[in-house]
């Protein structure tokens, strides 16, 4: 049940990431740590790296408010179920600084990819016989 809540939150975050991708030109063009090809059991650690990254609005034009609201939603901490287990994995996972830094567009694409991977693993974990490769 707790894991379900996490994954439902991940699904909602995908929509927020997709919305932010529409405003990449209004984000500060700063390079941010963007985990990719995250090793098994380090997904939550990588997720927290994405959440910690300083994604910022460039404060230009009239999209500033919607961008800031979306960034705030991205940074909202997930429910704390399984926090202990996640912490344990974090000890053996790469630090946020060790990940390749990317501009906002690629950062958001990689964040979305991680969220998709986590949801897909969750679906596959309770399904038999439909995963092919």
């Amino acid at each position: 049940q707790g894991q379900d809540r996490h994954m439902i939150r991940m699904r909602q975050l995908i929509d927020i990431v997709d919305q932010l991708k529409n405003y990449v030109n209004d984000l500060v063009p700063e390079f941010l740590p963007a985990p990719e090809d995250v090793e098994t059991n380090c997904e939550w650690s990588a997720f927290s790296c994405f959440q910690k990254a300083q994604l910022k609005s460039a404060n230009t034009g009239n999209n500033e408010r919607i961008i800031n609201v979306s960034i705030k939603k991205l940074k909202r901490k997930p429910p704390s179920t399984n926090a202990g287990r996640r912490q344990k994995h974090r000890l053996t996972c790469p630090s946020c600084d060790s990940y390749e830094k990317k501009p906002p567009k690629e950062f958001l694409e990689r964040f979305k990819s991680l969220l998709q991977k986590m949801i897909h693993q969750h679906l596959s974990s309770r399904t038999h016989g439909s995963e092919d490769s």
Partner: antibody, heavy 117, light 107 residues
């Protein structure tokens, strides 16, 4: 705005292989999941399966032995092959994008495939 | 596989009416449910995901609720463009499965 367009023969003979292609425009196929859903005449929707941009697939167990979904990132297309078709495979076939993995946010308009000799 | 049962199979309503469609899952699916709108010859449209989250660009007259096995799609004030068939879809495991559909017709 992502747009999807199905293409392929509208008539397939029994025992042959149904082949459809979905062309994606307004977005890249190199992220997200790309699926096929069908609707037999007068019936509900049936999920056939999907493929991730990296090539991992999930298929409906009821069709798994006969289905292959593949992706061609260079052409921004993905394809469905359904072998050994029968009249029961007559349906409108839809291709769709799944950004959220669990649901489909963009669909094609569908293409009717009739299985008949 | 999870079976999804929609009711009613069709409903007649007038512009401005409040319309409620229900969907029942054969086993608990938490909030893993999506709702779609489908018009003949058109591409189906995602309205709601994870039971109650409104898809970007969908009018706020559409809302979803429920969790576990019982779910509801509500159109608060029916508009002329809302006459269509609506499908629910279970999304908590593979295979993904759809309900039989509810046709919303003009009274």
């Amino acid at each position: 705005q992502v747009q999807l367009q199905e293409s392929g023969p509208g008539l397939v003979k029994p025992s042959e292989t149904l082949s459809l292609t979905c062309t994606v425009s307004g977005g890249s196929i190199s992220s997200d999941f790309w699926g096929w859903i069908r609707q037999p005449p007068g019936k509900g929707l049936e999920w056939i399966g999907y493929i991730s941009s990296r090539g991992s697939t999930n298929y409906n167990p009821s069709l798994k032995r006969r289905v292959t979904i593949s992706v061609d990132t260079s052409r921004n297309q993905f394809s469905l092959k359904l072998s050994s078709v029968t009249a029961a495979d007559t349906a409108v076939y839809y291709c769709a994008r799944s950004a959220g993995v669990t649901d489909f946010d963009f669909w094609g308009q569908g293409t009717l495939v009739t299985v008949s000799s | 596989d999870i079976q999804m049962t929609q009711s009613p199979s069709s409903v007649s309503a007038s512009v401005g009416d409040r319309v409620t469609i229900t969907c029942r899952a054969s086993q608990g699916i938490s909030s893993w449910l999506a709702w779609y709108q489908h018009k003949p010859g058109k591409a189906p449209k995602l309205l709601i995901y994870v039971a109650s989250s409104l898809q970007s660009g969908v009018p706020s007259r559409f809302s979803g609720s429920g969790s576990g096995t019982d779910f509801t799609l509500t159109i608060s004030s029916l508009q002329p463009e809302d006459f269509a068939t609506y499908y629910c879809q279970a999304a908590n495991s593979f295979p993904l499965t759809f309900g039989g559909g509810t046709k919303v017709e003009i009274k």
